[in-house]
């Protein structure tokens, strides 16, 4: 039993960020005379939150009218709570002293915990593109959440990934926390349309997790396959040679025709066809006048894809025999073709 007790009935209070926190406090007596003050923390570094005697505390309101006679309810409300408001709050009765007021009795304290939502997860991939069969790393970051407990999952096209590492910082007590996760993903040729998803679940999200995504189209490079073929003779002295560039991504591609090692023509892929898996096909052809050649001609289709070292495919065009095939349908009819006559 004591002359005056300061009662803080709530050991802890949990409030969502942006809401109002109510911190309850009652005194069992109004004697001795003196103000009630609220502090965050204890000891010499404690922070004054409210002083009944004087001061301006714009975020704080009293639950009851402290100017009312016999009022012993010293509860307060703190508006627009942020994670920085987390801590233990003490309701402290002071008594009039000479010359200064003297701390008389403190409540046991109420721990204010702030529930703050994590920020939208941001997923970032590697700086440079990588080719199928390679393993690439994706990072996911989310910040500003509290409490510390959080769940992070990775998915690729809806399938949960298992090869990832996650850290929540800081390790110790803090007003809010951040999560950082790195996942390893093995690329396949079919990943142009694939998505990597980072999913964050937290108590503040009420079962509706936040997601961050990265499109593998930003990460993957599928190198083309080349096929050079000689079409049936179009006319007595002309041969149509095509270079099929298949299954490449991204579209950025430059093709060069070489005749016996000499540059014949260079063109950039424009009118491409898209495959179901998101890769592209493109075809270029060359019309060769074989009558101008005494010797065999080595035709090379050289492709530089997405700034990578060139790949090439060659075809030996024999000039000694010109079998004539009537009525053949060739790609030379294509309006998008380019003709190159050799004399």
């Amino acid at each position: 039993e004591e002359e005056l007790q300061v009662i803080q009935p709530d050991k802890s209070v949990l409030v969502a960020a942006g809401e109002t926190a109510t911190l309850r406090c009652t005194a069992t007596s109004l004697i001795p005379v003196g103000p009630i003050q609220w502090f965050r923390g204890a000891g010499p570094g404690r922070e004054l939150i409210y002083n009944q005697k004087e001061g301006h505390f714009p975020r704080v309101t009293t639950v009851s009218d402290l100017t009312k006679r016999n009022n012993m309810d010293f509860s307060i409300r703190i508006g627009n709570i942020t994670p920085a408001d987390a801590g233990t709050y003490y309701c402290v009765k002071f008594r009039k002293g000479s010359p200064d007021d003297v701390e008389f009795k403190s409540g046991a304290g109420t721990e204010l915990s702030v529930r703050a939502k994590p920020s939208a997860p941001v997923v970032s991939g590697p700086a440079a593109r990588a080719t199928p069969q390679h393993t690439v790393s994706f990072t996911c970051e989310s910040h500003g959440f509290s409490p510390r407990d959080i769940t992070l999952k990775w998915f690729k096209n809806g399938n949960e990934l298992s090869d990832f590492q996650t850290n929540v910082d800081p390790v110790g007590e803090s007003v809010s926390y951040s999560i950082h996760s790195t996942a390893k993903v093995v690329l396949t040729r079919e990943d142009v349309h694939s998505q990597v998803i980072c999913e964050v679940a937290h108590v503040t999200l009420q079962g509706d997790p936040l997601r961050g995504t990265a499109n593998l189209s930003e990460t993957i490079r599928v190198p083309p396959t080349l096929e050079v073929t000689q079409q049936p003779v179009r006319a007595e002295n002309q041969v149509n040679v095509t270079c099929q560039v298949r299954k490449f991504y991204p579209q950025r591609l430059q093709l060069t025709w070489l005749e016996n090692g000499n540059v014949s023509r260079t063109e950039t892929a424009s009118t491409v066809t898209e495959n179901k898996d998101g890769t592209y096909n493109w075809m270029s052809w060359l019309l060769v006048n074989v009558s101008a050649h005494r010797d065999d001609v080595k035709l090379t289709c050289q492709v530089e894809h997405d700034g990578q070292p060139a790949v090439s495919k060659s075809h030996d065009l024999k000039v000694s025999a010109h079998p004539k095939e009537q009525g053949s349908n060739t790609a030379a009819e294509n309006t998008g073709s380019n003709e190159r006559n050799i004399y």
Partner: antibody, heavy 114, light 111 residues
Framework: QVQLQESGPGLVKPSQTLSLTCTVS????????VNWIRQPPGKGLEWIGI???????DYNSALKSRVTISKDTSKNQVFLKLSSVTAADTAVYYC????????WGQGTTVTVSS | DIVLTQSPASLAVSPGQRATITCRAS??????????MHWYQQKPGQPPKLLIY???NLESGVPARFSGSGSRTDFTLTINPVEANDAANYYC?????????FGGGTKVEIK
């Protein structure tokens, strides 16, 4: 139940120090303050001072230079010392609990005389 | 110091009648919404007994015939109806400012 009992010499010589003890029961001296009040014969009440539960003290400025209030919590006792007494210090001395003064001792009469 | 002046100095009342004692403070005894004024009854050879605290609150065990009112500097103790055993000295006391002070007392006699 709550009780307070004053004790001490009934006669003190002028210029000497008056020493009284208030023995309490039914409450803790760490939880409650104890006041000393005096009442000269046929006159009104005068507050001398208080010792709070935490051991801090507040005194009547008119007596401050001469008065000391202390306590021994383990013995449930509060002490009053008033130095350099004169005949004007002759009075019934009371101890009373806390700022509200809700419980009083019966009082002890102190006469200052040679 | 806050000086408390009680009036009247003495008062004779018949049983069943109302007795009113006033206490005027030289400065306000109000703080934080409350009046730190209390009333005590003292019978001869006895210590004072708390009747009313914080101007208007009846102490536990005290008959409801006693009531207190007032704020800031002017306070009243009312006994209604007066009974024979109410004959005593009555003191007001403030503990809003140091030093705590008592009024000079009012002697109530029963006719």
């Amino acid at each position: 139940q709550v009780q307070l009992q004053e004790s001490g010499p009934g006669l003190v010589k002028p210029s000497q120090t008056l020493s009284l003890t208030c023995t309490v029961s039914g409450f803790s001296l760490t939880g409650y303050g104890v006041n000393w009040i005096r009442q000269p014969p046929g006159k009104g009440l005068e507050w001398i001072g208080i010792i709070w539960g935490d051991g801090s003290t507040d005194y009547n400025s008119a007596l401050k230079s001469r008065v000391t209030i202390s306590k021994d919590t383990s013995k449930n006792q509060v002490f009053l010392k008033l130095s350099s007494v004169t005949a004007a210090d002759t009075a019934v001395y009371y101890c009373a609990r806390a700022g509200k003064m809700d419980y009083w001792g019966q009082g002890t009469t102190v006469t200052v005389s040679s | 110091d806050i000086v408390l002046t009680q009036s009247p100095a003495s008062l004779a009342v018949s049983p069943g009648q109302r007795a009113t004692i006033t206490c005027r403070a030289s400065e306000s005894v109000d703080s934080y919404g409350n009046s730190f004024m209390h009333w005590y009854q003292q019978k001869p050879g006895q210590p004072p007994k708390l009747l009313i605290y914080l101007a208007s609150n009846l102490e536990s065990g005290v008959p409801a015939r006693f009531s207190g009112s007032g704020s800031r500097t002017d306070f009243t103790l009312t006994i209604n109806p007066v009974e024979a055993n109410d004959a005593a000295n009555y003191y007001c006391q403030q503990n809003n400012e140091y030093p705590w002070t008592f009024g000079g007392g009012t002697k109530v006699e029963i006719k």
